[in-house]
Interface confidence: medium
């Protein structure tokens, strides 16, 4: 475990106070539990407007997700609620508290509020493998130009320490299966392939197991041949975003092109109530384009600061080269600022977080 990192198993509806800023707290909840995270103001002073973020995306309040300035509640938690949660100051985006939450398949036993007697029941002292950074494993496609080195990583933990093995397209994967071989770095839970070629394309699965269980993760490797083609944009980018009014948003667009690409960010607009012109071409405004002082890497990120309701809408990353154009789009939803968490319970009482 790293310095300043602790792992706690939490019982039903236990409220977890936030760690000191700069620390990351690792928390384990059972399926069906209420995840409650608390982030008191540092030093007990005024907090100011805050926003709760999961895996880099602002959380949308709902009947199940209750968001307040100092507290977050996720009711009836499931595996999908695992991830990295942080409470940030809305204006500065400074992280005040952050938590790594893991929701196990089995519901936690007992009704202990403090969670201190839960470790044996939920099996952390001895237990099945789990991903140590689940929020970092939701990206599945790795697109790489041919001849480069590739590293796949599946960082995991468990007790006893799990073993890791690798499959390619569902079959055991060993060094003799590819020219140039492979490097297995068990200490880093990684697979390394140097100088990849098109025949390396496929699905790579890490299998992490100990006597208590097994987990697996599959990545898809796409090797881009160095032949003339229009730009290739990474699948899933830019991603749809939901943001709270006044927060900052980043859209990312990953461009692969052997010929020098020209990248633009566009926002779709309406003209006289219409989104498209007479010829069917969408009306857009150019938000970001190449200039004398702009690198391709910078153009792959579109930053929106202090978003307003007018910023909501469709955004497009457009990449062109001498062969042709490619584009991917994403939507931004802007929600009103939620200053307080207010929930009426069954008795009709109201509390403010």
């Amino acid at each position: 475990e790293s310095l300043g990192t602790e792992q706690r198993v939490v019982g039903r509806a236990a409220e977890v106070p936030g760690p000191e800023p700069g620390q990351q707290e690792q928390l384990v909840f059972g399926s069906g539990d209420a995840v409650e995270l608390s982030c008191p103001p540092p030093g007990g002073g005024p907090m100011g407007p805050t926003v709760w973020v999961k895996d880099g995306t602002g959380l949308v309040p709902s009947e199940r997700v209750l968001v307040g300035p100092q507290r977050l509640q996720v009711l009836n938690a499931s595996h999908e609620d695992s991830g990295a949660y942080s409470c940030r100051q809305r204006l500065t985006q400074r992280v005040l508290c952050h938590f790594s939450v893991r929701v196990t398949d089995a519901p936690s036993s007992g009704d202990d509020e403090d969670g201190e007697d839960e470790a044996e029941d939920t099996g952390v002292d001895t237990g099945a493998p789990y991903w140590t950074r689940p929020e970092r494993m939701d990206k599945k496609l790795l697109a790489v130009p041919a001849a480069n080195t590739v590293r796949f990583r599946c960082p995991a933990a468990g007790n006893p320490t799990p073993s890791i093995s690798w499959l390619k397209n569902g079959r055991e994967f060993r060094g003799e299966h590819r020219i140039g071989g492979i490097k297995l770095r068990h200490q880093q839970w990684s697979l390394v392939m140097e100088s990849v070629v098109p025949s390396d394309r496929g699905n790579y699965t890490c299998v992490v197991e100990n006597k208590f269980g097994s987990i697996r993760q599959t990545y898809t490797l796409d090797v881009l041949e160095r032949s003339p083609h229009r730009p290739i944009l990474q699948a899933g980018l830019p991603a749809n975003q939901t943001a709270v009014l006044g927060s900052d948003v980043e859209f990312h667009c990953k461009v692969y092109s052997d010929a020098q690409p020209h990248i633009q960010w566009l926002k779709h607009v309406e003209v006289n109530g219409s989104k498209v012109g007479p010829d069917g071409t969408p009306y857009v405004t150019v938000l970001k384009t190449a200039g004398a002082n702009t690198t391709d890497k910078e153009l792959e990120v579109l930053s929106l600061h202090n978003v307003t309701f007018e910023d909501a809408g469709e955004y497009t990353c457009l990449a062109g080269n001498s062969i042709g154009f490619s584009h991917h789009s994403a939507w931004l939803v802007v929600l009103p600022a939620e200053e307080e968490l207010v929930e009426a319970d069954e008795a009709g009482s109201v509390y403010a977080g």
Epitope: R136, T149, K297, V301
Partner: antibody, heavy 130, light 106 residues
Amino acid sequence: QVQLKESGPALVKPTQTLTLTCTFSGFSLSTSGVGVGWIRQPPGKALEWLALIDWDDDKYYSTSLKTRLTISKDTSKNQVVLTMTNMDPVDTATYYCARYHSWYEMGYYGSTVGYMFDYWGQGTLVTVSS
Amino acid sequence: DIELTQPPSVSVAPGQTARISCSGDALGDKYASWYQQKPGQAPVLVIYDDSDRPSGIPERFSGSNSGNTATLTISGTQAEDEADYYCQSYDFDFAVFGGGTKLTVL
């Protein structure tokens, strides 16, 4: 064995352009996953990464200095050249070139590139003064 | 970009274990390298890929990396280990160095 050596003027005047050359041996800049980078170190201060050039001619620049930097390579001569415009006394530093290895991995927003610098030149001190 | 934070200085008695930390957001998701720099000399790679040693680097140098912190450990520190140490990683296709730590062997 791998060797790198930086060359260029020891003294430049403010507003002038600095041109540094890194001449290397023991490896080829046409080998996949290999590149050459420039790092500088003002007297008594920390290392600061400036620019990288990959075996396949991809170029990366420090965000804070990108408007002033240009990196290029001559694979046949085993040389990498860095130019830095509009020099200022705060640019006084020892400038190092270094070989690096790069790889692709899964990052938070999809594939990202990682680096590790395994061989360094001896460095050349550049003073900016009128 | 990620920022890597190191303590400015660490002191250790000869023969004791020195630990130098390097912290950055989700640093454990990336690979960290460590460089040793003695006065008037160029940096030398002492640890790469979190915990691997290049040939010629003594076994007393080791490394780890998890969570938000990478750590360089020097077991049985010797007088010749007195130097500046820099951690290095990467983010969004950029290389990043820490601010450096001066290791003093008392």
